[in-house]
């Protein structure tokens, strides 16, 4: 291809790609008609004056994953058509003032994964058409007022993975078109009232993995278009009553990994579009009535790994669309007979790793579509007659690691389990804990007459006599609600080059990969 440097490959579509450790300077001559240039994985350490002077038609320039630590202010002179510029994954500590001067068409500027220590208002003052600015993965400790004042068309700003300890309430005030703001993985301890007031078109706000302790009551009151709000892994100990009041478009809210002790009624809402609410790994001790009653479209509610010991009978009022409820790894001893009454569409419930000693006979009475129930590792000695009778879709029931009492009263449950073994899975079966002479024996095959020879076994009405079998040959544990496969916590739908590193285990919330989104 005419005019293509030997260390590069050039395509007929005016795309040039130069890669390799042997490259130590911008290759020349570059094709005059190049529209896309990528310089990747080279040993280039600096960009001198005007290395791209003869390729003024360039639209996209990617200089990534190099050793680049120094750029001359005029390096990008004559690139008036450039729309996309990436300097990501280099070793830049300083940006010269005026570096982006003349880049009048620039829409995307990626400066992520460098070592930038500061930015100044003058850096971006010429970039009036910029729509996307990526600054994540640098060493920024402070954003000065005015830094983004000229970027009135900006729709996406990523400041994640820096060292920001505070944010000025004025720094985003002119970004009325911003749709995505990411501030995750910084060291923010609080966010001043008014910080987000100018962001009337904001759709996503990522504040996870900071050290935020308090949220101002009106912090999000101007963000009526917010759809995704990530507040997980902070130090939030309480939520002001009105903090989420003005978020009618919100469909995703993550609050896991905080220090919340209580959820005050009405805190969530009205949020008619919220589909998922992640509250695991907090210190919640009780759930009052109506705490979620504004979340009419909620489908996933994760409350695992808290300290919940009391759930008011009306706690889940309003959750008529809920599909997944995770309550595992809490301190539940009792459940009121009406507590799940409203959950008509519930499919999966995880109650494992609690201290439940008994279940009300009608606990699942209105929850006819249940497909999976996790009850392992509780203090259950028996279950009420007919508790699962109406659950025709139940295909996964985990009952192991409970102290089952194998006396004559266990017979109805034993009979039902015998006829419904496919539901129990093959990993671990429930075993008797008492009497001592049958301890450790499978509850399903135990001879109750042997277990309590001195007790006459009465004719007890059995659990349903018709065995139930799944439609498909097997339900592998990899797709089960109790799967312990390592999976991410809520996917934080990022489409840029960043990936959020998550180490959360699937067992955090006891659900399937498909359910995690």
């Amino acid at each position: 291809y005419h005019g293509c440097p030997s260390e590069c490959t050039c395509s007929r579509a005016s795309q040039v790609e130069c890669t390799g450790a042997r490259i130590v300077a911008v290759p020349t001559p570059l094709p005059w008609n190049a529209m896309s240039l990528q310089i990747l994985n080279t040993h280039i350490t600096e960009l001198n004056e005007s290395p791209f002077l003869n390729i003024s038609a360039l639209i996209a320039l990617r200089i990534e994953k190099n050793e680049l630590s120094r750029i001359t202010p005029g390096a990008f002179r004559n690139l008036g058509s450039l729309r996309y510029l990436s300097l990501a994954n280099n070793k830049l500590q300083v940006l010269p003032i005026g570096l982006f001067q003349g880049l009048d068409s620039l829409e995307s500027l990626l400066l992520s994964s460098n070592q930038l220590l500061q930015i100044q208002p003058a850096h971006f003052s010429q970039c009036s058409n910029l729509k996307e600015l990526q600054l994540h993965g640098n060493h920024l400790e402070y954003i000065p007022d005015g830094a983004f004042d000229h970027l009135v068309g900006l729709t996406k700003l990523n400041l994640g993975k820096n060292s920001l300890t505070h944010i000025s309430p004025r720094v985003f005030q002119h970004l009325g078109n911003l749709q995505v703001l990411r501030l995750y993985e910084n060291r923010l301890t609080d966010i001043p009232m008014g910080t987000f007031d100018g962001l009337v078109n904001l759709q996503e706000l990522a504040l996870q993995q900071n050290q935020i302790g308090l949220l101002s009551p009106g912090l999000f009151h101007n963000n009526h278009n917010l759809q995704r709000l990530y507040l997980s892994n902070n130090h939030i100990s309480q939520l002001p009553p009105s903090v989420f009041m003005q978020l009618p478009q919100l469909n995703r809210l993550t609050l896991f990994g905080n220090s919340l002790k209580e959820l005050s009624p009405g805190i969530f809402g009205p949020m008619p579009n919220l589909r998922e609410l992640w509250l695991y790994d907090n210190h919640i001790s009780s759930l009052p009535d109506n705490v979620f009653s504004n979340l009419r479209q909620l489908q996933v509610l994760i409350l695992s790994r808290n300290q919940i010991s009391f759930i008011s009978p009306g706690a889940f009022n309003g959750l008529t669309e809920l599909r997944e409820l995770s309550l595992h790894t809490n301190a539940l001893q009792d459940l009121d007979g009406n507590v799940f009454r409203m959950l008509a569409n519930l499919q999966n419930i995880s109650l494992q790793n609690n201290r439940l000693r008994q279940l009300p006979g009608n606990i699942f009475a209105n929850v006819n579509g249940l497909m999976a129930i996790q009850l392992q590792n509780n203090q259950l000695e028996n279950l009420p007659l007919g508790i699962f009778d109406h659950l025709g879709k139940l295909c996964e029931l985990r009952l192991y690691d409970n102290p089952w009492r194998c006396d004559s009263d266990i017979l109805p449950l034993r009979n039902w389990l015998l006829l419904n073994q496919p539901r129990l899975g093959t990993d671990t079966v429930p075993v008797c804990f008492s009497p001592a002479n049958v301890r450790g024996q499978s509850l399903i095959i135990i001879n109750v007459n042997v277990a309590v020879p001195s007790v006459h076994v009465p004719e007890v009405p059995s659990y349903p006599e018709t065995p139930w079998y799944p439609d498909t040959p097997s339900y592998p544990d990899t797709t089960s609600v109790s799967s312990t496969t390592e999976l991410t916590s809520p996917v934080e739908d990022y489409t840029d080059l960043t990936t959020i590193q998550v180490t959360d285990d699937r067992s955090v919330w006891g659900m399937t990969q498909a359910q995690s989104g």
């Epitope: 009553p241 209580e262 009306g314 009022n317 009300p360």
Partner: antibody, heavy 118, light 107 residues
Amino acid sequence: QVQLVQSGAEVKKPGASVKVSCKASGYTFTDYYINWVRQAPGQGLEWMGWIYPGSGNTKYAQKFQGRVTMTRDTSTSTVYMELSSLRSEDTAVYYCARWGYGAYFTYWGQGTLVTVSS
Amino acid sequence: DIQMTQSPSSLSASVGDRVTITCKASQNVGINVAWYQQKPGKAPKLLIYSASYRSSGVPSRFSGSGSGTDFTLTISSLQPEDFATYYCQQYSSFPYTFGGGTKVEIK
């Protein structure tokens, strides 16, 4: 239908204890929390605590902690509220009450008058 | 503890009158407020729960409203059997607390 029937009136001396019973019928006794609420003569209502009959777990209002004990007998579907170290200000009608679909009191016993007088 | 301040403590009204009783919580209780009617020598009777939902069998002249800290019970047209004492109760957090009561008397 749900019914809560309480024991009869009691007269006690200061310092004594009283044990009031509440017999439940019309539903599965072990499956629903039962509360105790009292009302001094001419006064308002005061929540004392709850018991979960299935397990015997209790929660008491701080004001009564150490003086009140709530127990149950599942064989007779009866809950008991015992108040010790009685003083004249404990003179009141004591009600047992069951929650409905929320933590409000849908079903009430008829009340038991406890008079503390020397 | 959450205080429930009910007003007025008593009122005189005639049959057919519209009666309004208010209850103010000392902190946010969402919609977790119930209203009860009590007649002398009887146990209280649930009228309204979740601030605005009428209990089964309660006449439509009784209505409730409010959320957060301010709540109202309204009797749209007072009937002879409505002369009684009315209590509000919060069940948002322990200990559950009641208002001091409002006695509705015949004028």
